[in-house]
């Protein structure tokens, strides 16, 4: 019996087609992805093959203005239109709190939404009961297929699930649900979830009875043969894991942003054992036409987005200096504003010992592309912020050793004075540079804001300590020459859309007045500073 699994993950609000790098589509003839194009391909496969499942491994939420405006209603509407068979909850599905998941998505989705390792407690338990499930048994042709869901147990640190959801260890939670499916004589089981490729592989290895793992969160691109676009494969598709009980378990993921449609064919024997598995992600490029009816619906929904872009989010009473002359040479108040917004967006009081789990932010000055003038009645709009942050990136959470951070700050000023983009703006960090010293030895003081404290204060950076830092995904991926971040990071979780983070902060604050306040100091002559 042959099953075709079509899968997406980490689509992040890319409802419209995008450019090759998943940013805004500029030249339509070279654009990719989008739900209209995805639907064309899905329908083509559904017509050609008998037993097809369309699955999503989470993080549909968050990423473009579509989510900012429609808050998940767009996800439910278009996933319903594409007739998804099931979805696993990702961490970003909790970005607007539990209510922001229940009302727009859980109550509106015409497909089951799954997670076995999220347990509701207290008053939420009855409110959310039945709206998401640990598993679902789906009939496909003459057979049934069990799908068990899972979600990153780091979600409380990455999003806003509140205090009434408990995120259990994935493997511990999945095993009893798979066992239940076995007692229902369901012998073909897919684990569908959102915990990243490393956990996907562990699930394949450790959870008895799982036949296939369809994952997300780590935006992993797998491919067999010559890859069709810019993404470099992390391994073959499918990636085969040998389970502890000796089975070959295919593990798949389909990069992100709706650029590819994962396509996996599995052959099962009559006892539900996987005999063979093969496939590849399908690049959704312009050779695949956009479905006209879905496209028309997208265009109808788009109208509200254009109106939103020009509405006032809040006011500034000071000039927001986002000029390259400032932000690539010294502390600029636009950099401070953005970093403050980034920390504010990551306030998660999950432990009494910590005022917050993260206090530090770094931001490449070259990523700040425009100032905002206060003399326009102080008005700040989404359109203004899109000029400041035009790349459609995310502000991510990483864990780094102090030594890596020190290298990053050395890199920040290694060729100071040439208006290069790597000059770092900061939050929760005080840095002093001596630019008269040779490159690679210019950081003379680096103090960081404590987290395990009731009164936050600055302490010298410790080289061997592991720190959490919020930064643009561009830096996490080694952009602007920050290779040491990419190479040495201990953990990387993708965060919220950059503009959305700043716009939410401005809306919350109503009136802003960021200052230049001595976070970054530099001098060109020897001072008697102690090395740290």
């Amino acid at each position: 019996w042959e099953l075709t699994i079509l899968h997406t993950n980490d689509v992040h609000s890319r409802l419209e087609q995008t450019s090759e790098d998943s940013s805004k589509c500029v030249n339509a003839s070279r654009c990719m992805g989008g739900v209209a194009r995805l639907f064309t391909k899905v329908q083509q496969i559904r017509r050609a093959e008998p037993n097809v499942l369309l699955l999503d491994a989470g993080d549909q939420y968050q990423g473009t203005i579509w989510f900012t405006v429609y808050k998940g209603a767009e996800v439910a509407h278009f996933m319903n239109a594409l007739r998804y068979d099931a979805m696993a909850l990702g961490n970003h599905e909790f970005d607007n709190g539990v209510e922001g998941l229940i009302e727009p998505l859980l109550k509106e989705a015409k497909f089951p939404i799954l997670s076995a390792n999220i347990k509701a407690k207290g008053p939420l338990a009855s409110q959310i009961s039945g709206l998401y499930l640990p598993y679902k048994v789906l009939p496909v042709g003459d057979e049934v297929v069990g799908i068990v869901g899972y979600t990153s147990k780091e979600t409380p640190f990455l999003s806003n699930p509140g205090t009434n959801l408990v995120f259990e260890d994935e493997i511990t939670a999945l095993q009893p649900e798979v066992d239940k499916l076995k007692t229902l004589n369901v012998n073909k089981i897919i684990a569908l979830g959102h915990s990243g490729f490393e956990m996907d592989k562990l699930i394949a290895q450790k959870v008895r009875g799982v036949d296939v793992v369809v994952g997300g969160h780590s935006n992993t691109f797998l491919y067999t043969g010559n890859p069709p676009s810019k993404e470099v494969p992390a391994g073959k598709y499918p990636f085969i894991v040998t389970s502890d009980d000796g089975r070959k378990v295919p593990v798949v993921q389909a990069y992100a942003f709706g650029k590819y449609l994962g396509y996996l064919k599995i052959e099962f024997d009559e006892r539900g054992n996987v005999i063979s598995s093969h496939g590849n992600p399908i690049l959704l490029n312009s050779s695949i036409p956009e479905d006209p009816s879905i496209k028309a619906d997208i265009n109808k929904w788009r109208i509200k987005l254009d109106n939103y872009s020009t509405q006032e989010l809040g006011k500034t009473i000071v000039y927001l200096d986002g000029s390259s002359q400032s932000c690539r040479f010294r502390e600029c108040n636009m950099g401070n504003l953005i970093c403050d917004a980034m920390i504010n967006n990551n306030l998660r009081h999950t432990d009494e010992m910590f005022w917050n789990h993260v206090s530090m932010c770094i931001l490449n000055g070259g990523g700040i592309r425009s100032p905002i003038d206060e003399r326009n009645n102080g008005t700040i709009t989404w359109e203004n912020l899109a000029a400041v942050l035009p790349f459609g990136g995310t502000f991510d959470l990483v864990q780094l050793k102090g030594s890596t951070l020190k290298k990053a700050f050395e890199h920040s000023v290694h060729r100071y004075g040439q208006s290069t983009g790597e000059f770092l703006q900061v939050g929760g960090i005080h840095v002093v540079y001596d630019l008269s010293r040779k490159p690679g030895d210019r950081v003379v003081k680096l103090d960081v804001l404590c987290t395990k404290c009731r009164v936050p204060s600055y302490d010298p950076l410790k080289m061997d300590e592991v720190y959490k830092v919020i930064l643009p995904n561009f830096l996490a991926n080694g952009g602007d020459g920050f290779q040491m971040i990419k190479d040495e990071l201990l953990r990387h979780d993708s965060g919220d859309q950059d503009i959305n983070v700043v716009s939410t902060y401005i809306s919350k604050m109503k009136v802003i007045y960021p200052a230049v306040e001595g976070r970054i100091k530099a001098h060109h002559h020897h001072h008697h500073h102690h090395h740290h």
Partner: antibody, heavy 118, light 107 residues
Framework: QVQLVQSGAEVKKPGASVKVSCKTS????????IYWVKQRPGQGLEWIGW????????KYNEKFKGRVTITADKSASTAYMELSSLRSEDTAVYYC???????????WGQGTLVTVSS | DIQMTQSPSSLSASVGDRVTITCKAS??????VAWYQQKPGKSPKLLIY???TRHTGVPSRFSGSGSGTDHTLTISSLQPEDFATYYC?????????FGQGTKLEIK
């Protein structure tokens, strides 16, 4: 709350057909199976078949195959069971039921009595 | 098809009694057994599924046990509203099948 409301009692002649409806509310229709169950007067329960409205997959008990057709109208959140070439042994109460996660029948309609009599 | 044989087919008991109904499957059904209660002229009501999991709102006096081929429904202390017909069902494989019923009457 979850509700399944069935159409009213029917009296039919042998050889005729009957179509029983099951209108659902209080939940997402596409996300749960609808099962049909037969109960002859004073007798036990027999599973006729299912429909999964999400992908309109239908499975019949071999015993009922050929004369039973199960359908669903997603827009009306309603399932239907049609029984053709009626005979006297089809006289029974027909129930629709919903799962709460596959294979057991958590919520039931009130039943529809179909009487086949010449 | 899997046959489910219930016993007894009827039994008389008094309020406060402990009552046990058994169900034997013609082949191994693991723990995939449900129990229903039906009163005259009414639809069946789910009591227990997966052998021993009580459905929402079902009183704790109802319990289930067993695995493989032998399964049991126990009512620990009969209440007046418990007099009804009880059916077991295997939810292990299609076609899903029911026992022939056990009618519980007042002694």
């Amino acid at each position: 709350q979850v509700q399944l409301v069935q159409s009213g009692a029917e009296v039919k002649k042998p050889g005729a057909s009957v179509k029983v409806s099951c209108k659902t509310s209080g939940y997402t229709f596409t996300n749960y199976y609808i099962y049909w169950v037969k109960q002859r007067p004073g007798q036990g329960l027999e599973w006729i078949g299912w429909i999964y409205p999400g992908n309109l997959n239908i499975k019949y008990n071999e015993k009922f195959k050929g004369r039973v057709t199960i359908t669903a109208d997603k827009s009306a959140s309603t399932a239907y069971m049609e029984l053709s070439s009626l005979r006297s042994e089809d006289t029974a109460v027909y129930y629709c039921a919903r799962d709460d996660n596959y294979a057991w029948f958590a919520y039931w309609g009130q039943g529809t009595l179909v009487t086949v009599s010449s | 098809d899997i046959q489910m044989t219930q016993s007894p087919s009827s039994l008389s008991a008094s309020v406060g009694d402990r009552v046990t109904i058994t169900c034997k499957a013609s082949q191994d059904v693991s723990t995939a057994v449900a129990w229903y209660q039906q009163k005259p002229g009414k639809s069946p009501k789910l009591l227990i599924y997966w052998t021993n999991t009580r459905h929402t709102g079902v009183p704790s006096r109802f319990s289930g046990s067993g695995s493989g081929t032998d399964h049991t429904l126990t009512i620990s202390s009969l209440q007046p509203e418990d007099f009804a017909t009880y059916y077991c069902q295997q939810h292990y494989s299609t076609p899903f099948t029911f026992g022939q019923g056990t009618k519980l009457e007042i002694k």
